[in-house]
Interface confidence: medium
């Protein structure tokens, strides 16, 4: 079970990292800035 939990967490982490990488590529420094609105 602990292996499953670790794998699931790592999978989520990998997805989060992929999203961050995508955002950084598309947005550059904007990704870290305050100029964003809903």
């Amino acid at each position: 079970h602990s292996d499953g939990i670790f794998t699931d967490s790592y999978s989520r982490y990998r997805k989060q990292m992929a999203v961050k990488k995508y955002l950084a590529a598309v947005l550059g420094k904007r990704y870290k800035q305050r100029v964003k609105n809903k």
């Epitope: 955002l23 550059g28 420094k29 100029v35 809903k38």
Partner: antibody, heavy 127, light 114 residues
Framework: QSLEESGGGLVQPGASLTLTCTAS?????????MCWVRQAPGKGLEWIAC????????TYYASWAKGRFTISKTSSTTVTLHVTSLTAADTATYFC????????????????????WGPGTLVTVSS | DVVMTQTPSPVSAAVGGTVTINCRAS??????LAWYQQKPGQPPKLLMS???TLESGVPSRFKGSGSGTEFTLTISDLECADAATYYC????????????????FGGGTEVVVK
């Protein structure tokens, strides 16, 4: 789609002025950053301020423009720039410009470039 | 804040020739660069964004290249209508919390067509 500025002219030093930008062919119900940029005679482009046209209405100013310049959205097709304590250094053509914004994962980020510009309105500050 | 420096100005070439305009950023801005054309008495016109992506209606004679800190706008098969001042603008935003990305324009390069 077009933008048009109005309100420029000859003004006395120390006076205040309100410039208006009117959009045609599109409305601010879409999410943009509407901005003001000025250009002194024979000089380069100088960004002044932007406002997000969505519900937040967030405003952004160049560091030198804070306090004396105020940008506002006054209707679904108009944005104004109010300027106080005008000096000769404010003599310039004032352009209204649209930042089309980047829609990414539910947020509208500034594109940081301007895809539509108005023809400009000349403000001359002189006694 | 990012500082954009353009060279040379003015630059001239004959009709049918080629001109190259350089734009240098004071820090790495990846490919986040836009180019504008401004003719006397007119507002600037966006030519391209993201270094090389042409806006609709802009002829393919206009070509943008570069990345990082060094960028180039090349205009080939020059026409009289290309006589204008060209501005680059960093579109990467600002790494400073006290400024924004809209204010990073180059000083402009005048193109004279002979």
């Amino acid at each position: 789609q077009s933008l048009e500025e109005s309100g420029g002219g000859l003004v006395q030093p120390g006076a205040s002025l309100t410039l208006t930008c009117t959009a045609s062919g599109f409305s601010f119900s879409s999410n943009y950053y509407m901005c003001w940029v000025r250009q002194a005679p024979g000089k380069g482009l100088e960004w002044i301020a932007c406002i997000f046209t969505g519900s937040s209405g967030s405003t952004y100013y160049a560091s030198w423009a804070k306090g004396r310049f105020t940008i506002s959205k006054t209707s679904s097709t108009t944005v104004t720039l109010h300027v106080t304590s005008l000096t000769a250094a404010d003599t310039a053509t004032y352009f209204c410009a649209r930042d089309r914004a980047l829609s990414v994962v539910g947020y509208f980020y500034a594109a940081y470039y301007f895809d539509f510009w108005g023809p400009g309105t000349l403000v001359t500050v002189s006694s | 804040d990012v500082v954009m420096t353009q060279t040379p100005s003015p630059v001239s070439a004959a009709v049918g020739g080629t001109v190259t305009i350089n734009c240098r950023a004071s820090e790495d801005i990846e490919s986040f660069l836009a180019w504008y054309q401004q003719k006397p008495g007119q507002p600037p016109k966006l030519l391209m964004s993201r270094t090389s992506t042409l806006e609709s209606g802009v002829p393919s004679r206009f070509k943008g290249s570069g990345s990082g800190t060094e960028f180039t706008l090349t205009i080939s098969d020059l026409e009289c209508a290309d006589a204008a001042t060209y501005y680059c603008q960093c579109t990467d935003g600002s790494s400073s919390s006290s400024s924004y990305g809209w204010d990073a324009f180059g000083g402009g390069t005048e193109v004279v067509v002979k």
